[in-house]
């Protein structure tokens, strides 16, 4: 990656740390499989950070499937429910903060948040449940943290965030605490790579939250999800900002990196949208 621009990043000798999922399969999407049975099962939802019910067809699927809520929680939720995440890195707003709200093409309408560049604040919007763009956050806090300006007119991730012991949800805390190696970036960085539904073989990168690195994958040209970047640098910029590591000598080392203004463009022509 070329190294000449104005984005401040932390340099360390090692890769930034991975998301502390107890098992990598906890990040898999719920998969009902091809069979037609109706079996109540549970899976871990990385967006809500909770174990949730789904209907399993009875065959195939993946490992993110549990007989009981308790088993799911045991395998995929952490005991240290009061772990604290702290980010202290000053940054520019990511490009996607300036995108218009985009409900996508599905019809499972839910409340999400986007950064409204006209009002300069995060606001709720009606999201259809699929596609859309990256200016789409599950919580107000996440939106503010990534897209709203800090008090001095620059972007600063200054939220201590505590995992709520009751429902595993992230809630803002004002306490200043030492940083731990936890993920506090956009939620789509936690989704698995998704080839999509078409037949092309485009070279793309996705953020692998289990190993904490951006990795190449082949994209079909349509569908998929938002964990999809045209360059490794773009992937790192969007997803690695969620990890903040304290350097042992106590300071942050800054570097300048070339910023490519390229954005992911997803073709929608051949998408088959299931009823939601």
């Amino acid at each position: 990656d070329s190294e000449e621009d104005e984005e401040h990043t932390i340099i360390t000798d090692t890769e930034l740390p991975p998301l502390k999922l107890m098992h990598s399969f906890c990040a898999f999407k719920a998969d009902d499989g091809p069979c037609k049975a109706i079996m109540k099962r549970f899976f871990f939802n990385i967006f809500t950070r909770q174990c949730e019910e789904f209907i399993y067809g009875g065959c195939e699927g993946n490992q993110n499937r549990f007989e009981s809520l308790e088993e799911c929680k045991k395998m995929c939720t952490r005991d240290n429910a009061n772990r604290i995440i702290k980010t202290t890195l000053q940054q520019e707003k990511p490009d996607f903060c300036f995108l218009e709200e985009d409900p996508g093409i599905c019809r499972g309408y839910i409340t999400r948040y986007f950064y409204n560049n006209q009002t300069k604040q995060c606001e709720r919007f009606k999201y259809g449940g699929c596609l859309g763009n990256m200016n789409n956050f599950e919580t107000l806090e996440e939106c503010k943290n990534i897209c709203e300006d800090g008090p001095n007119g620059f972007q600063v991730d200054n939220y201590g965030t505590q995992l709520n012991a009751v429902n595993n949800s992230l809630t803002p805390q004002s306490t200043k605490v030492p940083s731990l190696f936890e993920f506090h970036g956009p939620s789509w960085c936690l989704t698995p790579a998704d080839r999509g539904l078409c037949r092309a073989n485009e070279n793309r990168f996705y953020y692998n939250s289990v190993i904490g690195k951006c990795r190449p994958f082949k994209y079909s040209g349509c569908g998929g999800n938002e964990n999809n970047f045209t360059s490794k640098q773009e992937c790192l910029r969007a997803c690695k900002k969620g990890f903040i590591q304290r350097i042992s000598k106590g300071g942050l080392i800054k570097t300048k990196r070339k910023r490519k203004k390229q954005r992911v463009k997803i073709a929608y022509e051949e998408i088959f949208v299931k009823n939601m």
Epitope: E101, T111, E123, F125, L140
Partner: antibody
Amino acid sequence: EVQLVQSGAELKKPGASVKLSCKASGYTFTSYWMHWVRQAPGQGLEWIGEIKPDQGRINYNEKFKTRATLTADKSTSTAYMELSSLRSEDTAVYYCARSSVVDVALDYWGQGTTVTVSS
Amino acid sequence: EIVLTQSPATLSLSPGERATLSCSASSSVSSSYLYWYQQKPGQAPRLWISGTSILASGVPARFSGSGSGTKYTLTISSLEPEDFAVYFCHQWSHYPFTFGQGTKLEIK
């Protein structure tokens, strides 16, 4: 003081249309969502839709999407709700209520407008 | 849409008694998106509780809210005469936003 003042009662025949108004004062009209909620006699509350006057963003309850039209006049800080093809089951009290841009805490409500649909 | 079912439809209690009003959702709703409103005859509803448990301005401390997922509860520890009204639960997690049919709290 925040106030939402709604237009007066309406008596309409089936098939007709009605346009209700809600005049806001005491706050920045364009910075909040305006919702319309109705309540049939002795019944619960039903959300019709919401409009954000600054950018004209509108979300409808699908049930009303073909019959309800939400508009707002920024110059007079007034929100409007027009309901067409009226039927007897549209007889209700119609409320406007505001919420912030981040949640749907309906913190201020109009006094309500009674719409009666009868032949 | 998410259907909110409130129970009981009518609750007849005396002042000083404890009241428990339930709201059940047809699908899971995040607790941040579950609100309660109070309505008295001839008046517009009033925001009463936001985010499952946060009392709106001016709401007495005898009121409390709890719950998660599909089950939510509004509790009044010791009823006062002014508490007798209709209470509606409301969700805005999913569109369309929906309300329960209401629980009427009446004096026995």
